[in-house]
Amino acid sequence: EVEKTACPSGKKAPEIDESLIFYKKWELEACVDAALLATQMDRVNAIPFTYEQLDVLKHKLDELYPQGYPESVIQHLGYLFLKMSPEDIRKWNVTSLETLKALLEVNKGHEMSPQVATLIDRFVKGRGQLDKDTLDTLTAFYPGYLCSLSPEELSSVPPSSIWAVRPQDLDTCDPRQLDVLYPKARLAFQNMNGSEYFVKIQSFLGGAPTEDLKALSQQNVSMDLATFMKLRTDAVLPLTVAEVQKLLGPHVEGLKAEERHRPVRDWILRQRQDDLDTLGLGLQG
């Protein structure tokens, strides 16, 4: 509709304000200056634009910044972020943690969208590694974030960042991921004393080798059964009955309830019956 392309007299927007919600789409296109919009992006969030109107505002920004938005605009996108495609986001260079937080806030409480996944990927690649502050932020918004990374991606996590990891952040990690994270955790916590060290390392033990489990068995750690059940089968098999007894302490009685499940089942089959009998649990090898 060519006749609608010129801004009607008196409708040119001097600023981004609530009056614009009454503009039709073509009026927004014709009467809102893209540069003005870019400088007043922080106001858009507070104005109840429809999604159709947000489409027009996005289009204006796309025309102004065909190579991708500057960070000064990205930081104030707010709900307009929901209109961005992963392709749009790949053009961005986001370096500020504050910008990342502002955009994650828009998505807060919901599963990670493709947009958010792309944003995080761009941000982490831009930083070169997953530093502690970034990891802190990401796991606060998405507790499962760490376990969504491939072992290759996890290899870029510096040991110092491991301090930001909470036990629940590892709930959905598989053994391949824990294989990568465990040595980093071991390095990060190496200067802690026995009991404190065990508290910190416990959630990473799914990646621990046999020799480390043997060492822990000498430290009266009293590992619970839930942790024991997450250990690598190949790491548990070489342990002796005496070592497992020391590792579990008072929790050793829990082996009976788990005797049909790995790694307990496989470990029992590797032991001499005489040794198993010393536990007094009725375990049959």
Epitope: E18, L82, G109
Partner: nanobody
């Protein structure tokens, strides 16, 4: 998803009043604004009034001083009190809600309720 159901439309004489209601159900969390639009015969759909989840209301010039929008956050319901109605207010009135988070961001619309102002 989010469902919107309008009620309260009808036939009224010029100068009379009507109160429209719109009840939201389903994914009512994250509604950031609700509003009323109308579409008269042969016209485009136009915004009449909108209210944000923080209670800020805005009105089209043509209804200022005559219409009042309000929201009951607990009941997830928005109302439009229409006084001093004129024949030019005749239209189908549509309720609208903005939901501004994943997994279903977007504008949600009701089916519309007919308002006819005629003597």
């Amino acid at each position: 998803q989010l469902q919107l159901v309008e009620s309260g439309g009808g036939l009224v004489q010029p100068g009379g009043s009507l109160r429209l209601s719109c009840a939201a159900s389903g994914s009512v969390n994250s509604i950031t604004a609700m509003g009323w639009y109308r579409q008269g015969p042969g016209n485009e759909r136009e915004l009449v009034a909108v209210i944000t989840d923080r209670g800020r209301a805005s009105y089209a010039d043509s209804v200022k001083g005559r219409f009042a929008i309000s929201m009951d956050n607990d009941k997830h319901t928005v109302y439009l009190q229409m006084d001093s109605l004129k024949p030019e207010d005749t239209a189908v009135y549509y309720c609208n809600a903005h939901r501004r988070t994943w997994p279903h961001p977007g504008d949600y619309w009701g089916q519309g309720t007919q308002v006819t102002v005629s003597s």
